[in-house]
C-alpha cells in the first residue's frame, strides 16, 4: 500500500518526540560553603557554582538557594560527589586507650523537596565510618541512580558536617542531574 | 490553517532528532600497563581495551593512544572506576612507630585535552588517603558525571601510582562515556 | 533531485526513532534478604523492592526472583550501590596478636546472565579490603556503567556476604539500569 | 517556633483586587512552598494555588487562573495572593500554608468579606 | 479535576467507638492527606503519604489505602476529636479536598 514502506514496527515511536539537545541538565561544583543554620537533626545543604569552570544549568534546569529545580517531569539520572577531608577522627584515639567506640561517620544524602509531600525525601544516602589512624584522612563518596521527578521537584545535597567538605577543587565535589 | 494541526506544544521539538543507537558511546576495560615516561609532577595515563570482552566504541568514538577522541560537540556522561591494591602502606608503619605522618593517597583523574587550550582539564577527581593496618589492601575509586565536550577533545584516565592499578579484571577498573 | 530537500545531515538520523519516555527503565531499592541457599563458589544474590517507594520498573523492563529482565537489544547504563556495615573485622584483632593476615573484604558484582551463554559474564565488580579498627563499621560500595545488552538478558547483583547488606533503607542500597 | 500570619483588608468591594500577605517565621521560607487554600462560609476547602519561593515558580487552581497571582518576597519573608474582580462567591477565610520539605503548618486563617 | 468523594458526610459515635471514613479519588493518586478542623480553626494535618502519622499526632488516628481507594481511622474516640475531617490529594493540579465529614458525639 502506498507510503506503508515508512510504517514504524513496535518499537519504534515518532511523537512526541524531543531532541535531546532540548531536554534540563545541569553540572553544579563546590564552592566554599558559609555556615547556615539548620534544624537540628536535618544535615546542612550544600551551595553550589552554576555558571562558572566547569559548571552549568541548561534548558530550563535552574539553580537556586541550595536547590536545582525541576523543570519538566520525567525521569532522571542524579548524581554527586563529595570530598570529605579532617584531621585523625576522635575514634583511633579512644582505641588506643583501650575502649571500644561507635566510629565518627561521614554521609551525603540527596534529598528530593516536593510540594505534594509534608517532610523532604532521601533519594540516595552515602555513608562511611571513619575511623582513620593517619593524622589527615580524605576520601570520596559517589552517589547516582535514576528517580521520577514531577515539575517543582527540588533537588538539594546535604552533609553531614559541611566543615568537613573539600571545596578546594570543582572536580573533587559537585552535584548534577540530566532528563533521561 | 492548513498544516496547523500537529504545530508541536513548546515542550515538543521534532528537529534535529536522532536515533538513540547513532550517538557515540564507549566502554573501555584494563589491560596491563606498560611503565611509561611522564613528567614529574603529572599523574600517568592508563591505557586501555576497546574491542576485546566488554570493552567496545561505536559511532565514530574512537579510542587511540590512551585517548577517547570526542566525534561531536554535546553533553556527554563520562565515567570510570579504579581499583588499586598494594601492601601495607607506610603510614601505618611509621604511626607506629609514633611519628605523625602524612597519609599516603590513591588518585584517578579523569582529564580532558583540548587542542585550542594549553592546559589539560581536569573533570572528575577521586582522591583517598590510604592508611591501611592489614598487610595487602585493596578498594575501588568510582568517578562519573556529565560535561559539555568539544568535537576533537580527548579525554584520558590518570591515576597517581600506576604501579597500584589492579588490572587483572575487565569489570574492577573501567573507563567510559556516551553522548546523552 | 527531487525529494533530496529534506535529506539530513551526517549528525542527523530520523528514523528509528523513539519517545524516550519508552524506554526501557528500573530502579529497584533493597528490602530485607532471606537467607537463600548458593553454590559455594558462588556469591549469592540480592533480591530487591520493585513497586514500593521510590522503586519502579517501566516499559517493559520487569524484575523477577533476583532479577532485571532486558526487554530490548541495545546500550544500558546499569548502576548498582551496596552499603555494607558489621562489627570490626578479624582483621584488626588478628593484626593486634603480630600475624600478618589476609584482610576481610566485601565484594558487589553485577552479573549478566544470557541463556546462550553457559557462564554468568562479571559486568562490574567493586571490592574493598576491610581492616576497620573502630567497633562498628559501614560503608557503601558503588558501581555504573554502560553495557550492550541482548533481549532476554538477566542483571542480577551478588555480594560477597548477604549478611552485611544494609537493608534498612531504600536510598542506601539499590539497583538500576535504562535503556540509553 | 513557625509561625504564618495573614494580613490584608477585611472588607473587599465587588469587581476589585483582594490583597493579602502572608508574614513567615521560624524557617527558610526557600527550603519549603507556599500555597494559599480558602473556605467559604459552610463550605469545604479549596486550594487556590501555589509558589516555590526558592524560584518563584506558580502554579494555580485551573478555575480560578484567570484571577489569580502568587508572589513572593524572599527578603521580606512574605507571600503575597491577589484575587482580581471578586464577587461576593469570594468571599471566605482565606489561609497561607506551608507544605514539602518540612512538616505542614497553616496560619490562622483571614476572613475576607467582599461586599458594597 | 481529580475528584474527592469523601463518606460519610457526618457520623455520630459514642467514646471509645472505632471511627472509620473513607474517601475515593476519581483516578489513582499516590499521597492521601488527612486533616482535621475544629471550628474556628485552622485546619491540622494528621496523616500523610496515605499512612505516616504527622508529628505529635495520637496514635489512635491511622490511615490506609492506596491508587483510588483509602481509609481514615479513629481507633477509639475521644471527646476531643469532635471535628470536622478532610481527605485531600496534592498531586494532580488542581489539589482537591474532600467534602468533609463531621464527627459528632452521641
Known amino acids: 500500500l502506498k507510503g506503508q514502506e515508512f510504517a514504524p514496527s513496535h518499537q519504534q515511536v515518532y511523537a512526541p518526540l524531543r531532541a535531546d539537545g532540548d531536554k534540563p541538565r545541569a553540572h553544579l561544583t563546590v564552592v566554599r560553603q558559609t555556615p547556615t543554620q539548620h534544624f537540628k537533626n536535618q544535615f546542612p545543604a550544600l551551595h553550589w557554582e552554576h555558571e562558572l569552570g566547569l559548571a552549568f544549568t541548561k534548558n530550563r534546569m535552574n539553580y537556586t538557594n541550595k536547590f536545582l529545580l525541576i523543570p519538566e517531569s520525567g525521569d532522571y539520572f542524579i548524581y554527586s560527589q563529595v570530598t570529605f577531608r579532617g584531621m585523625t577522627s576522635e575514634c583511633s584515639e579512644i582505641r588506643q586507650a583501650g575502649r571500644p567506640n561507635k566510629p565518627d561517620s561521614i554521609t551525603v544524602v540527596i534529598t528530593k523537596v516536593t510540594d505534594s509531600y509534608p517532610e523532604p525525601t532521601q533519594l540516595l544516602m552515602g555513608t562511611k565510618s571513619v575511623c582513620e589512624v593517619g593524622s589527615n584522612w580524605f576520601q570520596p563518596i559517589y552517589l547516582g541512580a535514576m528517580f521520577s521527578l514531577q515539575e517543582g521537584d527540588k533537588l538539594m545535597v546535604n552533609v553531614s558536617d559541611i566543615s568537613l567538605v573539600d571545596y578546594t577543587k570543582e572536580d573533587k565535589t559537585f552535584f548534577g542531574a540530566f532528563l533521561l | 490553517l492548513k498544516g496547523q494541526e500537529f504545530a508541536p506544544s513548546h515542550q515538543q521539538v521534532y528537529a534535529p532528532l536522532r536515533a538513540d543507537g547513532d550517538k557515540p558511546r564507549a566502554h573501555l576495560t584494563v589491560v596491563r600497563q606498560t611503565p611509561t615516561q611522564h613528567f614529574k609532577n603529572q599523574f600517568p595515563a592508563l591505557h586501555w581495551e576497546h574491542e576485546l570482552g566488554l570493552a567496545f566504541t561505536k559511532n565514530r568514538m574512537n579510542y587511540t593512544n590512551k585517548f577517547l577522541l570526542i566525534p561531536e560537540s554535546g553533553d556527554y556522561f563520562i565515567y570510570s572506576q579504579v581499583t588499586f591494591r598494594g601492601m601495607t602502606s607506610e603510614c601505618s608503619e611509621i604511626r607506629q612507630a609514633g611519628r605523625p605522618n602524612k597519609p599516603d593517597s590513591i588518585t584517578v583523574v579523569i582529564t580532558k585535552v583540548t587542542d585550542s587550550y594549553p592546559e589539560p582539564t581536569q573533570l572528575l577527581m577521586g582522591t583517598k588517603s590510604v592508611c591501611e593496618v592489614g598487610s595487602n589492601w585493596f578498594q575501588p575509586i568510582y568517578l562519573g558525571a556529565m560535561f559539555s565536550l568539544q568535537e576533537g577533545d580527548k579525554l584520558m584516565v590518570n591515576v597517581s601510582d600506576i604501579s597500584l592499578v589492579d588490572y587483572t579484571k575487565e569489570d574492577k577498573t573501567f573507563f567510559g562515556a556516551f553522548l546523552l | 533531485l527531487k525529494g533530496q530537500e529534506f535529506a539530513p545531515s551526517h549528525q542527523q538520523v530520523y528514523a528509528p526513532l523513539r519517545a524516550d519516555g519508552d524506554k526501557p527503565r528500573a530502579h529497584l531499592t533493597v528490602v530485607r534478604q532471606t537467607p537463600t541457599q548458593h553454590f559455594k563458589n558462588q556469591f549469592p544474590a540480592l533480591h530487591w523492592e520493585h513497586e514500593l517507594g521510590l522503586a519502579f520498573t517501566k516499559n517493559r523492563m520487569n524484575y523477577t526472583n533476583k532479577f532485571l529482565l532486558i526487554p530490548e537489544s541495545g546500550d544500558y547504563f546499569i548502576y548498582s550501590q551496596v552499603t555494607f556495615r558489621g562489627m570490626t573485622s578479624e582483621c584488626s584483632e588478628i593484626r593486634q596478636a603480630g600475624r600478618p593476615n589476609k584482610p576481610d573484604s566485601i565484594t558487589v558484582v553485577i552479573t549478566k546472565v544470557t541463556d546462550s551463554y553457559p557462564e554468568p559474564t562479571q559486568l562490574l565488580m567493586g571490592t574493598k579490603s576491610v581492616c576497620e579498627v573502630g567497633s562498628n563499621w559501614f560503608q557503601p560500595i558503588y558501581l555504573g556503567a554502560m553495557f550492550s545488552l541482548q533481549e532476554g538478558d538477566k542483571l542480577m547483583v551478588n555480594v560477597s556476604d548477604i549478611s552485611l547488606v544494609d537493608y534498612t533503607k531504600e536510598d542506601k542500597t539499590f539497583f538500576g539500569a535504562f535503556l540509553l | 517556633q513557625v509561625q504564618l500570619q495573614e494580613s490584608g483588608p477585611g472588607l473587599v468591594r465587588p469587581s476589585q483586587t483582594l490583597s493579602l500577605t502572608c508574614t513567615v517565621s521560624?524557617?527558610?521560607?526557600?527550603?519549603?512552598?507556599m500555597h494559599w487554600v480558602r473556605q467559604r462560609p459552610g463550605r469545604g476547602l479549596e486550594w487556590m494555588g501555589r509558589?516555590?519561593?526558592?524560584?518563584?515558580?506558580?502554579k494555580y487552581n485551573p478555575s480560578l487562573k484567570s484571577r489569580v497571582t502568587i508572589t513572593r518576597d524572599t527578603s521580606k519573608n512574605q507571600v503575597s495572593l491577589r484575587l482580581s474582580s471578586v464577587t461576593a462567591a469570594d468571599t471566605a477565610v482565606y489561609y497561607c500554608?506551608?507544605?514539602?520539605?518540612?512538616?505542614?503548618?497553616w496560619g490562622q486563617g483571614s476572613l475576607v468579606t467582599v461586599s458594597s | 479535576d481529580i475528584q474527592m468523594t469523601q463518606s460519610p458526610s457526618s457520623l455520630s459515635a459514642s467514646v471509645g467507638d472505632r471511627v472509620t471514613i473513607t474517601c475515593r479519588a476519581s483516578q489513582g493518586v499516590m499521597y492521601m492527606y488527612w486533616y482535621q478542623q475544629k471550628p474556628g480553626k485552622a485546619p491540622k494535618l494528621l496523616i500523610y503519604g496515605a499512612s505516616n502519622l504527622a508529628s505529635g499526632v495520637p496514635s489512635r488516628f491511622s490511615g490506609s489505602g492506596s491508587g483510588t481507594d483509602f481509609t481514615f481511622t479513629i481507633s477509639s474516640l475521644q471527646p476531643e476529636d469532635i471535628a470536622t475531617y478532610y481527605c485531600q490529594q496534592w498531586e494532580g493540579n488542581p489539589r482537591t479536598f474532600g467534602q468533609g465529614t463531621k464527627v459528632e458525639i452521641k
Open positions: 509558589i516555590d519561593p526558592a524560584s518563584g515558580h506558580t
Open positions: 521560624g524557617f527558610d521560607m526557600g527550603d519549603t512552598y
Open positions: 500554608v506551608r507544605s514539602g520539605g518540612m512538616p505542614d503548618a
